[in-house]
Interface confidence: medium
């Protein structure tokens, strides 16, 4: 495929990545699928600078990111190493809380109203952010 050189319409470019901010809410898995269909992934936050950029755009609204522990350890959807990477959890989070009465714990991470992260029930219909890297090859066939 050819390399993507500019962001699609209605996406925001920042530091060689393109970001798309949802206006509606979906469960984490549906949000994850939406981004994949756009040849992107749920946002992966790798620095304080990127955290501030995303936070500025989403405002004080619960918003899914590409981080989950549905299979045990916390994992970023693009394979970025969680243990050595950037983290911005709220105090005492993640806590895998079971007291919500919805069954199971809390396996998906989201930005909270102040930008810090919390783990929550993956079925909650939060907004989400998709991200794709400008330097990666797109899935479209090259023009002949």
């Amino acid at each position: 495929g050819s390399e993507r050189t500019c962001c699609p319409v209605n996406w925001v470019e920042h530091e060689r990545s393109c970001y798309w901010f949802s206006r509606s809410g979906k469960a984490w898995a549906d949000a994850d699928n939406y981004c994949r269909l756009e040849d992107a992934h749920l946002v992966v936050v790798t620095s304080w600078e990127e955290q501030k950029f995303v936070q500025h755009h989403i405002g004080p609204v619960n918003t899914w990111m590409g981080l989950h522990d549905q299979n045990g350890p916390w994992k970023w959807v693009d394979g970025t190493d969680y243990e050595t990477g950037f983290k911005n959890w709220r105090p005492e989070q993640p806590d895998d809380w079971y007291g919500h009465g919805l069954g199971g714990g809390e396996d998906c991470a989201h930005f909270t109203d102040d930008g810090r992260w919390n783990d929550d029930v993956c079925q909650r219909p939060y907004r989400w952010v998709c991200e794709t890297e400008l330097d990666k090859a797109s899935q479209e066939p090259p023009l002949l």
Epitope: V12, R23, I58, G59, P60, V61, N62, D113
Partner: antibody, heavy 118, light 106 residues
Framework: EVQLVESGGGLIQPGGSLRLSCAAS????????MSWVRQAPGKGLEWVSV???????YNADSVKGRFTISRDNSKNTLYLQMNSLRAEDTAVYYC????????????WGQGTLVTVSS | EIVMTQSPATLSVSPGERASLSCRSS??????LAWYQQRPGQALRLLIY???IRATDIPARFNGSGSGTEFTLTISSLQSEDFAVYFC????????FGQGTTVEIK
């Protein structure tokens, strides 16, 4: 200090046009989401129009096809072009800064009055 | 469109007393609700966002509560500068406002 100052209001006949301005200081208009909100006399507030950082614009159904929001980055100013004005457009028009794309409005101007009457 | 309904339309309270303002949405807005204060001749001021979080420099006497469709703004001890019009706003789906509650001196 963040400040928003609206201007351009006045008395206009039905069917006429008017352009409102909102001069911003203390922050950069182009790197923020910005909205116009109006308040008819003795009534509540109604969101009218928004412009995103990338330039995309969206309008409330009540003004669709008649009102256009825009900005001049060099002047750090927000505009609302109002065409085909109706009596029901009579209101105080406020510009406001959105806190994020879909958050609340964290700063407001003091408003400019638009009166549509023959 | 999500319709926001505020009650009462007018609230008469003595200085130092407590005021409770109600806001109801026609469908769930989760906690994506804000409260604003409008004083005559002044710009609107954001008081509360996220249903219960005080905005910067807002005094502790202003408290928001609720989630889903039912919300309350409580002013614990009314000061002279608190007599004003208060609006709730949902930002779960675009933006819509209530019609406002006027808090007047009794």
């Amino acid at each position: 200090e963040v400040q928003l100052v609206e201007s351009g209001g006045g008395l206009i006949q039905p069917g006429g046009s008017l352009r409102l301005s909102c001069a911003a200081s203390g922050f950069t208009v182009s790197s923020n989401y910005m909205s116009w909100v109006r308040q008819a006399p003795g009534k509540g507030l109604e969101w009218v129009s928004v412009i995103y950082t990338g330039g995309s614009t969206y309008n409330a159904d009540s003004v669709k096809g008649r009102f256009t929001i825009s900005r001049d980055n060099s002047k750090n100013t927000l505009y609302l072009q109002m065409n085909s004005l109706r009596a029901e457009d009579t209101a105080v028009y406020y510009c406001a800064r959105n806190w994020g794309m879909a958050g609340p409005f964290d700063y407001w101007g003091q408003g400019t009055l638009v009166t549509v009457s023959s | 469109e999500i319709v926001m309904t505020q009650s009462p339309a007018t609230l008469s309270v003595s200085p130092g007393e407590r005021a409770s303002l109600s806001c109801r949405s026609s469908q769930s807005v989760n906690s994506n609700l804000a409260w604003y204060q409008q004083r005559p001749g002044q710009a609107l001021r954001l008081l509360i966002y996220g249903a219960s979080i005080r905005a910067t420099d807002i005094p502790a006497r202003f408290n928001g509560s609720g989630s889903g469709t039912e919300f309350t703004l409580t002013i614990s001890s009314l000061q002279s500068e608190d007599f004003a019009v208060y609006f709730c706003q949902q930002y779960n789906n675009w933006w819509t406002f209530g019609q406002g509650t006027t808090v007047e001196i009794k």
